[in-house]
């Protein structure tokens, strides 16, 4: 499969915003690209979100995706919003190269999101 | 329209070598990785091995089963994939197959070793 | 090496019946795999990419699902010409790119 690059862990903001880049080496030249973001608890895979995109375009997720990112050359940018303290876990992200055959897959080693809760602001009396 | 065509199969003795061939056409041979897969008489299919492509520095892969006597190279100028079968074994008779990714698949060559 | 097991070895089915076959993975393989048809006497051919995807050309009756370590290869309304045997293989890296068993079908 293809090497798949991606940061070891990140940090959410105090929004529940985490960013990360997603960098794929292509042995050929797709035109075609889906990039998958799964999440990993034990042995359970889920799937966060997915977009397909032609190189030179912009990556689109659906409307209701907890997901936007933009695409340049062999390097995807990923924003998963909407975190919470419970969503901290392990985010793999999986490239397929969908067109022209032949079908390429590569899996990354996966980013581990940290996701703390922001504490409640305490009541002011002025 | 996309063409692999295996050659170099036969009949050989054990612990003799012979060099199968793969000549492909009709797709961008260079992009592909070269797989070769095996099914021996009246048994399921077996993945021998893998050459990936220039971007990949031509990384080389091999099933347990054949790693230390296979070899396979590629001449991408000729879109052609080999592979060198040495010390040969009764069990490495087989149909052998060469597949561009895994999209495209060969015909197949006949092995038969056996004294 | 992640194993793959497929099942059953063989079955018999009347055209128009659907059909199962189940492929597992001894670790999670995140929808690498393939299936491939094989007719009598002819090479495999690509059916099924990346679990899900069909392969160009592949009649629509032919499916695949499952994803982590559990995969499906449907045949909605099983034909003559579908008298075959069919093999999934694990394409995740590092290899080896190991096939299932496979599983024969043929028509009642």
């Known amino acids: 499969a293809m090497h798949v690059a991606q940061p070891a862990v990140v940090l959410a903001s105090s929004r529940g915003i985490a960013s990360f880049v997603c960098e794929y080496a292509s042995p050929g030249k797709a035109t075609e690209v889906r990039v998958t973001v799964l999440r990993q608890a034990d042995s359970q895979v889920t799937e966060v979100c997915a977009a397909t995109y032609m190189m030179g375009n912009e990556l689109t997720f659906l409307d209701d995706s907890i997901c936007t990112g933009t695409s340049s050359g062999n390097q995807v940018n990923l924003t998963i919003q909407g975190l919470r303290a419970m969503d901290t876990g392990l985010y793999i992200c999986k490239v397929e190269l969908m067109y022209p055959p032949p079908y390429y897959l590569g899996i990354g080693n996966g980013t581990q999101i940290y996701v703390i809760d922001p504490e409640p602001c305490p009541d002011s009396d002025f | 329209e996309v063409q692999l065509v295996e050659s170099g199969g036969g009949l050989v003795q054990p612990g003799r070598s012979l060099r199968l061939s793969c000549t492909a056409s009709g797709f961008t041979f260079s992009d592909n990785w070269m797989n070769w897969v095996r099914q021996a008489p009246g048994k399921g299919l077996e993945w021998v091995g893998q050459i990936r492509n220039k971007p990949y520095n031509y990384e080389t892969y091999y099933s347990d089963s054949v790693k230390g006597r296979f070899t396979i190279s590629r001449d991408d100028s000729k879109s052609i994939a080999y592979l060198q079968m040495n010390s040969l074994k009764t069990e490495d008779t087989a149909v052998y197959y060469c597949t561009g990714g895994m999209d495209y698949w060969g015909q197949g060559t006949t092995v038969t070793v056996s004294s | 090496d992640i194993q793959m097991t497929q099942s059953p070895s063989s079955l018999s089915a009347s055209v128009g019946d659907r059909v199962t076959i189940t492929c597992g993975a001894s670790?999670?393989?995140?929808?690498?795999l393939n299936w491939y048809q094989q007719k009598p006497g002819k090479s495999p051919k690509l059916l099924i990419y990346?679990?899900?995807n069909l392969a160009d050309g592949v009649p629509s009756r032919f499916s695949g699902s499952g994803s982590g370590t559990d995969f499906t290869l449907t045949i909605s309304s099983l034909q003559p010409e579908d008298v075959a045997t069919y093999y999934c293989?694990?394409?995740?890296?590092?290899?080896?790119?190991?096939f299932g068993g496979g599983t024969k079908v043929e028509i009642k």
């Open positions: 670790e999670i393989i995140y929808g690498a």
């Open positions: 293989q694990k394409i995740l890296s590092p290899p080896p790119w190991t």
């Open positions: 990346g679990a899900t």
